[in-house]
């Protein structure tokens, strides 16, 4: 009943709780002298399902057969309607539609830790939509039994609150769960187990790691476990990896030596425990321990390259460049690089430690034979030095690679190809492909990039530090013993027409012809490698097509003569620049009138 029902009653047959698909009869009856003016024909009883009218009857009672009710609770309310008055609530009832409980499945019990309590879980099966009570029963040796009830709507877990002890680890216990509601009951299959079957150890704790003599090869992992633990499994991985290394150990007694860790690497370690070889379950993994392994001296050798620049008749500038060792080769934090410069005949040597840079520039005499050695040092030692003899890398013309080409290869890549040198190609020991942004004036501060290629290769894909719409000066060196030959080319990964034309800064007259000088286009406006300049001229105020002169682009060139102008005629001149993608807009216009005599 949902209210006091003073005016009448609602009865439900066969029951307020019914099986899905059943029919119910709902009767609404007025109590004596509770109708409209005591005249039953005026009484109109209306039956509502929630807020919808579903039936009505004029008289003292209403009978309604209801079918097709959904799972769950449906509310029925009976109201009385009298002429010229609001409906009056008489009484109501809730009908609960559900199903009998299914047999609980997969009953399993566990005790977390040797001091924990026994708790069981099961699968309820489909929802009954009714109040369902679950009773969990545990029986053990000596006719001992424990029972626990659960009245939650969704009950699939109960804790007995009792602790099984290891005194008799082979004693059998049996658990069973029974579900009961108004429509029926069902019991699970019994689950029989021993102490060793159900005790799941607590995860290990207090995990530590020690490196004897600060060496990665002498590493021991320590931890604490519950007293009965027999087995452990360890897993560990570098912090940046997703794959675990796994080790199983028996009777470890809280320690294990690890032999395959990499130096200067942060690792994550976890440990799990088990009481018996084939009974019971593994504990959860412990909390992670993160620890960095000690450094070891670097392995591998630095990749070193250099460039020479002529200063004057007696001096030359040497710029050395080297690449960082990989993490696995550095095996620690590189503190400095040691550069040794030596004159081979006189034996003079100069050593310098470089920190924070991977390049070094010095000035040496042009005479003598010079060699350098570069090594990387961390807290444990130094890598083997890379030794190179300083030579004129482009001196041997017969060693120069032939037919060098540079073509765009997808986004921000350039494919460089070449043919072996004319001189015995088998003499080539390796090729080096070098590239740097092209800067007019040959700025030596521009970063240098290089890669090494085996002697049988005739192409290389360069992608490191390659930007779109930038022109690169690319050199291919063929090295053979203490000789080298080189060829160069300009290349870009992506190009478009330059954004502006050259700016003419001066026009001068020289013996009947003129010399035009211009400023280079800013690098960021060149939009790739320039191929040509064009100089245009036409008579001022003329509508004729301009004449033009096309000059191949050379980095250092910024002037050009023109000798086809008529004297005493005023001309307008301007310039454009071209890449493979097209021509720039006009640069500035300049007027000029040649003063020389006419022929």
């Amino acid at each position: 009943k949902i209210d006091a029902c003073k005016r009448g009653d609602v009865t439900v047959k066969p029951s307020h709780v019914i099986l899905l698909g059943s029919t119910v009869n709902i009767t609404c009856s007025l109590k004596p002298r509770q109708g409209c003016f005591h005249y039953s024909r005026r009484n109109k009883l209306i039956l509502y399902k929630f807020d919808r009218r579903i039936n009505f009857h004029h008289g003292h009672s209403l009978n309604s057969q209801v079918t097709g009710l959904p799972l769950g609770t449906t509310l029925f309310v009976c109201k009385l309607a009298c002429i010229n008055s609001d409906e009056i609530q008489i009484c109501g009832a809730e009908i609960f539609v559900g199903v009998a409980p299914e047999q609980p499945q997969n009953l399993s019990c566990i005790q977390k830790g040797e001091q924990g309590t026994v708790a069981c879980t099961w699968e309820r099966g489909r929802d009954t939509h009714l109040y369902t009570e679950y009773t969990l029963q545990l029986s053990g040796p000596k006719n001992l039994t424990w029972q626990k009830q659960c009245k939650d709507i969704y009950c699939d877990y109960l804790d007995f609150g009792i602790n099984l002890t290891p005194e008799s680890p082979e004693s059998n216990f049996t658990a069973k769960v029974t579900a009961v509601n108004s429509l029926g009951s069902s019991s699970s299959l019994p689950s029989t187990f021993t102490f060793l079957d159900i005790v799941r150890p607590l995860p290990p704790w207090d995990i530590r790691i020690k490196f004897q003599k600060a060496s990665v090869s002498r590493c021991t992992l320590y931890w604490r476990d519950e007293g009965l633990v027999l087995l452990n499994r360890l897993r560990y991985r570098p912090s940046n990896s997703r794959l675990w290394n796994m080790v199983n150990v028996t009777k470890a007694k809280g320690r294990h030596d690890l032999l395959d860790l990499k130096p200067f690497t942060e690792y994550e370690f976890q440990i799990s425990s088990k009481l018996h070889l084939y009974k019971g379950s593994w504990s959860d993994w412990s909390e992670s321990l993160r620890a960095q392994t000690p450094e070891e001296e670097p392995t591998g050798m630095l990749d070193v390259w250099y460039m020479k620049r002529h200063i004057d008749y007696s001096r030359q500038q040497i710029s050395l460049f080297w690449k960082n060792l990989s993490v696995s080769e550095a095996r620690g934090k590189i503190l400095h690089y040691q550069v040794t410069l030596q004159e081979l005949t006189g034996g003079k040597a100069m050593t310098q430690n470089i920190t924070g840079h991977t390049s070094w520039t010095t000035v040496i005499p042009r005479t003598g034979n010079w060699a350098v050695a570069v090594s990387a040092a961390n807290s444990k030692g130094s890598s083997l030095p890379t030794r190179i003899n300083i030579m004129n890398l482009c001196e041997a013309g017969l060693l120069a690679p032939r037919q060098v080409s540079a073509n765009s290869e997808g986004m921000d890549n350039i494919l460089v190809t070449w043919q072996p040198p004319r001189k015995d190609p088998s003499a080539v020991q390796e090729y080096v492909v070098e590239w740097r942004e092209l800067h007019p004036g040959g700025d030596t501060q521009v970063p240098l990039n290089w890669l090494r290629s085996r002697p049988y290769n005739v192409s290389a894909l360069i992608s490191e530090n390659i930007k779109s719409y930038i022109c690169y000066e690319i050199r291919v060196y063929a090295l053979s013993g203490d000789q080298g030959g080189c060829s160069s080319i300009l290349g870009n990964s992506k190009h478009k027409a330059p954004l502006s034309g050259p700016h003419i800064n001066a026009i001068t007259e020289e013996k009947g012809s003129i010399l035009i000088s211009w400023n280079s286009i800013p690098v960021q406006e060149q939009m790739g490698c320039l191929l040509h300049y064009r100089i245009y001229w036409k008579e001022r105020d003329s509508n004729s097509q301009p004449q033009l002169c096309e000059i191949p682009y050379r980095v250092s060139q910024n002037s050009h003569p023109i000798n086809s102008l008529q004297p005493r005629v005023t001309y307008v001149l301007w310039m454009t620049a071209l890449t493979a993608a097209g021509e720039s807009s006009h640069g500035n216009e300049r007027e000029f009138c040649l003063q020389g005599k006419a022929n």
Epitope: R52, N55, F56
Partner: nanobody, 123 residues
Amino acid sequence: QVQLQESGGGLVQPGGSLRLSCAASGFTFSTYAMSWVRQAPGKGLEWVSAVNSGGLSTDYADSVEGRFTISRDDAKNMLFLQMNRLKPEDTARYYCAKYEDCSDYVCDRAGYWGQGTQVTVSS
């Protein structure tokens, strides 16, 4: 699935009579109170009459009281509406519906309603 099929409409002169029928299927007809509902051109749905699940009680809108009679035959799953003394304002399309589709006599057209039957009262 639930289906309701109305018939018996037509053109009739004022003061004339018509009998509408509704054939029901796909549900336990005898356990449901039923209604007749109409919709005049350009107007909303208007509840006309109802009969309870036993067929013993009936209810009518004030506009048709004394002129229309609702009845049912549970053996044949049929609902009827006898319309006498018809007036031009009774012109509408008539639908049969479950009573529960018209809570507080405001009707919602359910997906299983039929096409209705047209009644036109005109001289």
